[in-house]
């Protein structure tokens, strides 16, 4: 049958040959393949300024296979499309275009955003965060003892990170100041060596803490007796209570 086609076409093309290569049923020196063997696709291959017919088992990038009764050819995808399933359904767009429902768009429709990695129009995703954890114990420098004024923290997880146009994530941790009844650190918490030195240092820190929290400008340089200290602390506590009534509570948020 193919031989018959090759023989017949010799009337139209002086150089038609039956001894074709690469899946051609009929071919010529000038045009390359004229027709293809069954199941192969005809495509024009550009070689410089010349176009040569070739027969392929599948179509090259930028083309899709069209099958008609006994005649198959590679048909170009639309001008903005790199890879397509058929004329109306693109699977990969050319540079600068975004894929949406098989079409190539230069910008994404409302309610969608461009994913510059996949070059697709995707739904806008907003941030989702979990509920807050309970507040942590009141702490200072990683300890829960040896101070009156510390900080407590609570955290939450990001359940869904936002896409480029999505709502930003809220803070994932929150810290606030807290006041507790000062309790002495046990031996294990203080360490064995230099307890006296540490006690002096602690007292100094407490003074720093209380003086700064009561808006005092200077710091006492002398070391106070336990009685003086207790008296002073009582006064500071009263001041703090009065201030706290006004201020309710101080809260600091930090994003991590």
């Amino acid at each position: 049958q193919n031989a018959s086609r090759g023989r017949r076409q010799r009337r139209m093309h002086p150089n038609v040959s039956q001894g074709c290569q690469g899946g051609c049923a009929t071919c010529s020196d000038y045009n390359g393949c004229l027709s293809c063997k069954p199941r192969l696709f005809f495509v024009l291959e550009r070689i410089g300024m010349k176009q040569i017919g070739v027969c392929l088992s599948s179509c090259p990038s930028g083309y899709y296979g069209t099958r008609y009764p006994d005649i198959n050819k590679c048909t170009k995808c639309k001008v903005d499309c790199d890879t397509c399933f058929n004329k109306n359904f693109c699977t990969k767009c050319k540079s600068g275009f975004y894929l949406h429902l098989g079409k190539c768009l230069d910008s994404c429709p409302e309610g969608l955003e461009a994913n510059n990695h996949t070059m697709e129009c995707v739904s806008i995703v907003h941030c989702e965060a979990s509920e807050w954890s309970p507040w942590s114990p009141c702490m200072k420098k990683g300890k829960t003892c040896g101070f009156k004024r510390g900080t407590e923290t609570r955290v939450r997880d990001i359940l869904q990170h936002p896409s480029a146009k999505g709502n930003l994530c809220p803070p994932t941790s929150e810290t606030r100041t807290c006041i507790v009844q000062r309790k002495k650190c046990s031996k294990g918490e203080r360490g064995k060596k230099g307890r006296e030195r540490k006690r002096k240092k602690l007292n100094k820190e407490e003074r720093k803490e209380t003086s700064s929290s009561s808006d005092s400008k200077g710091l006492e340089s002398s070391i106070e007796t336990p009685d003086q200290q207790e008296n002073k602390e009582r006064q500071q506590q009263q001041k703090r209570r009065a201030r706290d009534k006004q201020q309710k509570s101080v809260s600091v948020s930090t994003v991590h």
């Epitope: 049958q1 018959s4 086609r5 017949r8 076409q9 009337r11 139209m12 093309h13 049923a25 009929t26 071919c27 010529s28 045009n31 390359g32 393949c33 004229l34 027709s35 293809c36 005809f42 024009l44 176009q51 017919g53 069209t66 008609y68 009764p69 006994d70 005649i71 050819k73 048909t75 170009k76 639309k78 001008v79 004329k87």
Partner: antibody
Framework: EVQLQESGPSLVKPSQTLSLTCSVT????????WNWIRKFPGNKFEYMGY???????YQNPSLKSRISITRDTSKNQYHLQLNSVTTEDTATYYC?????????????WGQGTLVTVSA | DIVLTQSPSSMYASLGERVTITCKAS??????LSWFQQKPGKSPKTLIY???RLVDGVPSRFSGSGSGQDYSLTISSLEYEDMGIYYC?????????FGAGTKLEIK
Amino acid sequence: EVQLQESGPSLVKPSQTLSLTCSVTGDSITSGYWNWIRKFPGNKFEYMGYISYSGKTYQNPSLKSRISITRDTSKNQYHLQLNSVTTEDTATYYCATYYGYGGPWFAYWGQGTLVTVSA
Amino acid sequence: DIVLTQSPSSMYASLGERVTITCKASQDIDSYLSWFQQKPGKSPKTLIYLTNRLVDGVPSRFSGSGSGQDYSLTISSLEYEDMGIYYCLHYDEFPLTFGAGTKLEIK
């Protein structure tokens, strides 16, 4: 030289079936693709369909429910049937051949036959 | 279906003149374009296929060019026998479609 010749009635009544034959000489209809094309008054051409070397057919979707293309290899002829004709089907009907995408399309045409649809 | 828009629809030209007829497709037809000529009372005659390839026996004054959606047929030096109606035809996909024709007459 390949030659194609259309034949059939020149007048058909509305709602009847238009039947034409294309007789081919100089080539076998078991090679290539054998087509029907029509030209309406006013010079507008319409592609109707083809029958391939193996006997498979393609019909223009605009005519699909009404058109049938068949062949008789022993006579080296192929046929067109168009059902339920109206005056809109008045045209000159041509048969033509091509051999593949890399060669000339409609390298050979019949001389055409005018079919008038009228009561 | 692909629409082929041919222009002009008719024209007058002098013998020896260079004539160009254009055909614009509604989408890229990848060079699968043919030109044929029809004279009154005669069957069509294919002149050019695959945009720029001359059918055997067609005078070399006929040439075709183009790509994508835009194609043209040029007659380098018009001769009397060139009068008739010229049509473009695409065969990039089925159904094939034709231009409406350009009637070429001698001045």
